[in-house]
């Protein structure tokens, strides 16, 4: 805390300049009107003030907004929105993309911290969903963005919103969160050709059900080894031997070398052995000729 | 990596003179505005003298008229000429991008003026 001082003589700011930089912080204090400063914000991000004189600043700020600063000065904020905490945060109604645009450029190339998260936290409540433009912009600051978010959060992205995600935008996602957002790609993509859907619906891939990927074997897609690790096994184990082969196409070759990972290794363990065999890849685990397989999960659902 | 290492503090009597080297590497220094700091014992810091790549200077209203500020770039390194020096110099200078805003921080060269 800047002690409370006079300001000398002459040294009254009549504006937020340049010559601001030479002020100590009981200077800065004692000269600089809090009204002028949240009136002329836009032109602080552009004077290299130390980060102790940001936090006099800062400072005078919290003394005049004690409530949460008002749009039109958190807009123009720059390097002093790194001085923020999160409930310096909480306190501010954003609405407007262009401002949430503003900060993010500041903490641009740094990892997502926890005021970053708390403006995104504030910014799309606010919006009630997040809607296109607003993933955009933040996939675009935060590659990992969407897959931060909780399967209840993620309910809230419309449809529409999916073609603005990346691939590498799903990178961490959990077969939790592509559950809820395949459905939506799906939806988003359902009027694209076969060729182009599988180009979109690919990154997704990890939260489709078992009949989605029997309907995608028939269309020739050639899905690669990569995708297919990433498919849930639950809805892998019940497709046929002839199916995999149909989804993979050429690809299938790189089933040998994953054949003890999952869900490949599991999936081996529910196919005929002889069918396997047809394959010619040498993927043993299958179930030997003359085995009766019973699936007690249907006989349960039949009584 | 941003390197600066100041160097020429010393010693001196009041009215004298002193000049200081700030030699930097690690980013492009003719790009790059530049700032003389200094931190007094039990005081703050305050910023002494600014020098910007297109070379337009600015100082401090204490030290205005007796220090200089000035830069060479063939060798990555910025000057700060004193004179007229009194005992109210004393402190520890750093010099600094004026883009990093972290002001007085580091070794920095110290520099005693004694009546």
């Known amino acids: 805390e800047v002690e409370k001082t006079a300001c000398p003589s002459g040294k009254k700011a009549r504006e937020i300049d340049e010559s601001l930089i030479f002020y100590k912080k009981w200077e800065l204090e004692a000269c600089v009107d809090a009204a002028l400063l949240a009136t002329q914000m836009d032109r602080v991000n552009a004077i290299p003030f130390t980060y102790e004189q940001l936090d006099v600043l800062k400072h005078k700020l919290d003394e005049l907004y004690p409530q949460g600063y008002p749009e039109s000065v958190i807009q123009h904020l720059g390097y002093l929105f790194l001085k923020m905490s999160p409930e310096d945060i909480r306190k501010w109604n954003v609405t407007s993309l262009e401002t949430l645009k503003a900060l993010l450029e500041v903490n641009k190339g740094h990892e997502m911290s926890p005021q970053v998260a708390t403006l995104i936290d504030r910014f799309v409540k606010g919006r009630g969903q997040l809607d296109k433009d607003t993933l955009d912009t933040l996939t675009a600051f935060y590659p990992g963005y969407l897959c931060s978010l909780s399967p209840e959060e993620l309910s809230s992205v419309p449809p529409s919103s999916i073609w603005a995600v990346r691939p590498q935008d799903l990178d961490t996602c959990d077969p939790r969160q592509l559950d809820v957002l395949y459905p939506k790609a799906r939806l988003a993509f359902q009027n694209m050709n076969g060729s182009e859907y599988f180009v979109k619906i690919q990154s997704f891939l990890g939260g489709a059900p078992t009949e989605d990927l029997k309907a995608l074997s028939q269309q020739n897609v050639s899905m690669d080894l990569a995708t297919f690790m990433k498919l849930r096994t639950d809805a892998v184990l019940p497709l046929t031997v002839a199916e995999v082969q149909k989804l993979l196409g050429p690809h299938v070759e790189g089933l040998k070398a994953e054949e003890r990972h999952r869900p490949v290794r599991d999936w081996i363990l529910r196919q005929r052995q002889d069918d396997l065999d047809t394959l010619g890849l040498g993927l043993q685990g299958g179930i030997p000729n003359g085995y009766l397989v019973l699936d007690l999960s249907m006989q349960e659902a039949l009584s | 990596e941003v390197e600066l290492v100041e160097s020429g503090g010393g010693s001196v009597q009041a009215g004298e003179t002193l000049r200081l080297s700030c030699t930097a590497s690690?980013?492009?220094?003719?790009?790059?505005?530049m700032g003389w700091y200094r931190q007094a014992p039990g005081d703050e810091c305050e910023l002494v003298s600014t020098?910007?790549?297109?070379?337009?200077?600015n100082y401090a209203d204490s030290v205005k008229g007796r220090f200089t500020i000035s830069q060479d770039n063939a060798k990555n390194t910025v000057y700060l000429q004193m004179t007229s020096l009194k005992p109210e110099d004393t402190a520890i200078y750093s010099c600094?991008?004026?883009?990093?805003?972290?002001?007085?921080w580091g070794q920095g060269t110290l520099v005693t003026v004694s009546s």
């Open positions: 020098i910007s790549s297109d070379g337009s200077t």
């Open positions: 690690g980013f492009t220094f003719d790009d790059s505005d």
């Open positions: 600094r991008t004026m883009a990093s805003r972290i002001g007085c």
